[in-house]
């Protein structure tokens, strides 16, 4: 058994690529808008032009299409600590990213927050930073890696899980303890 | 089901500090972002603090920077807002949401009014 086509499929499926069928008159196919621009009316007639206009500042279409209106250009969150790489133009949205040194930490799949690269004092990095992803730091002798900063094994409480890494120190705190002076 | 309990909110002058909680069960606590959330008199929702699933990152809204502190204890599934040097415009109802804008789950919320 074929599955039927949605209405959607059906309406796509039957003008060639770069036309869409006409909203009053599905025997006509109109030419879509280029990028930078919107529909403004469809065409009369099969072989007449579509009545595009171009985006006006603050919008812009990215792609061939035939929107009724442009979208509204993003704007980067400066509470984010976000900047602006690109402005906006009629056919390319703002291009919002962050500073020398920071990476970007996604909250959502559209939304994140650049914050700094980790700088690995008291350890050697081990992967740099990238866009997405801070330094990852490998600690010195007598460090653990604590929220990927490296902290001295003196502040390393029993119950936390650097007890393993700092072990020998525990034991040489201890045993420097234990032992009586000579 | 996902629940969210609020607790901690309350009548405090200006300049005094409140701890918020925020009890979460239902889901795996210990693998979502989660946020603060207010709504003051009047006014629409303001997106006050996030923090990530392990405690790496938070955000912070400009207006409570450096005064209010988001942590989280995902051993006991609770959602912490310390909030210091409180003014008359943090006075709205606080809410813990799971995730980060837009958000999919809300407490009931916990009033605190700040005013002398």
């Known amino acids: 058994l074929v599955p039927h086509l949605g209405d959607r499929e059906k309406r796509d499926s039957v003008c060639p690529q770069g036309k869409y069928i006409h909203p009053q008159n599905n025997s006509i196919c109109c030419t879509k808008c280029h990028k930078g621009t919107y529909l403004y009316n469809d065409c009369p007639g099969p072989g007449q032009d579509t009545d595009c206009r171009e985006c006006e500042s603050g919008s812009f279409t990215a792609s061939e299409n035939h929107l009724r209106h442009c979208l509204s250009c993003s704007k980067c969150r400066k509470e984010m600590g976000q900047v602006e790489i690109s402005s906006c133009t009629v056919d390319r949205d703002t291009v919002c990213g962050c500073r020398k040194n920071q990476y970007r930490h996604y909250w959502s799949e559209n939304l994140f927050q650049c914050f700094n690269c980790s700088l690995c004092l008291n350890g050697t990095v081990h992967l740099s930073c990238q866009e997405k992803q801070n330094t990852v730091c490998t600690c010195h002798a007598g460090f653990f890696l604590r929220e990927n900063e490296c902290v001295s094994c003196s502040n390393c409480k029993k119950s936390l899980e650097c007890t393993k890494l700092c072990l020998p120190q525990i034991e040489n705190v201890k045993g420097t303890e234990d032992s009586g002076t000579t | 089901e996902v629940q969210l309990l609020e607790s901690g909110g309350g009548l405090v002058q200006p300049g005094g500090s409140l701890r918020l909680s925020c009890a979460a069960s239902g889901f795996t606590f210990a693998t979502y972002n989660m946020s603060w959330v207010r709504q003051a008199p009047g006014k629409g929702l303001e997106w006050v603090s996030a923090?990530?699933?392990?405690?790496?990152?938070?955000y912070y809204a400009d207006s409570v920077k450096g005064r209010f502190t988001i942590s989280r204890d995902n051993s006991k599934n609770t959602l912490y807002l310390q909030m210091n040097s409180l003014r008359a415009e943090d006075t709205a109802v606080y809410y813990c949401a799971k995730g980060t804008e837009p958000f999919d789950y809300w407490g009931q919320g916990t009033l605190v009014t700040v005013s002398s």
């Open positions: 923090i990530d699933a392990g405690g790496m990152h938070t």
